[in-house]
Amino acid sequence: EPPTACREKQYLINSQCCSLCQPGQKLVSDCTEFTETECLPCGESEFLDTWNRETHCHQHKYCDPNLGLRVQQKGTSETDTICTCEEGWHCTSEACESCVLHRSCSPGFGVKQIATGVSDTICEPCPVGFFSNVSSAFEKCHPWTSCETKDLVVQQAGTNKTDVVCGPQDRLR
């Protein structure tokens, strides 16, 4: 009686259960009554990540340097390549098919979270008592200078974009 279902890591063909090819190998010929399944290793820059009956291996993803991409983890015969972005850039999607330059935080805003290869810079407005006078992808908001600790007084108030200006205390006549 020919089988209607096969064991794990097998497939049904011509009323017969044949072994699947292991990850990293592709199918060359199905098994017969007298021969085992014939499999061949994937070639250079190719992979198959499951037990399979594929006759062609998949090409590794190409991390195109012209799109700002580089290889984060090289593919093997069983795994695909993982791409990431060059420093200063981040992926435009989860698949990381291209990169864009990290955003800078404008004056009045500081970096809340520095960008990574997969996420952009997160900026936050400088709260009262803090300032940022540069456009930067790294700088946080800096606290205003404390004039009092220097035995000085505030001559000009600070803003979210400028530090306070300290000056000498008025001498009592």
Partner: antibody
Framework: QSVEESGGRLVTPGTPLTLTCTVS????????MSWVRQAPGKGLEYIGV?????SAHYATWAKGRFTISKTSTTVDLKITSPTTADTATYFC??????????WGPGTLVTVSS | AVLTQTPSPVSAAVGGTVSISCQSS????????LSWFQQKPGQPPKQLIY???TLASGVPSRFKGSGSGTEFTLTISDVQCADAATYYC??????????FGGGTEVVVK
Amino acid sequence: QSVEESGGRLVTPGTPLTLTCTVSGFSLSSYAMSWVRQAPGKGLEYIGVMNTGGSAHYATWAKGRFTISKTSTTVDLKITSPTTADTATYFCARGYIGSPNLWGPGTLVTVSS
Amino acid sequence: AVLTQTPSPVSAAVGGTVSISCQSSKSVYYNNYLSWFQQKPGQPPKQLIYLASTLASGVPSRFKGSGSGTEFTLTISDVQCADAATYYCAGGYTDSDDAFGGGTEVVVK
């Protein structure tokens, strides 16, 4: 950004030795790290690589003779049972062979009885 | 994988051009995962070229890498005395079967 090897010294044959590659200015979750060695007066020899995901791959000749592992800022190369043939300067390099690299100055291992 | 380089040493005259070949026993990763390194005695290797033809930062444009798949060439034009060194090709492959060539010594006359 820099990489620096340490731990090289004189050891007797069969005494395990661990070399450390310390990185600064970049993350090991973003870059693979390769190990290469060079015997005195000889050519460069690829040992293996630590992938960003934490898996290590070895040159065929190096399997069983070396173990590569990592922490958040270091990548270690353990010479499991050194022989005199393992006397060499050991280098770690950021990235895969063939791609852009950043190399350390190397650390010298001498195996002698 | 095995990388076979031009037999060593290779002689070059100051101001002249020298080419070093590197043949791989199989295609390198992406067909371009090949680097060229320069090494002088007592120094670590210095990367000149990566991804077969991209010039590393700070390397003079006199150094040029070419080739794809299994055949690669490093060409040094307008050779200088400072170019006297040993040059290595290095290939990256799937499953990290990476390798270095045996090295080619360049002697400048």
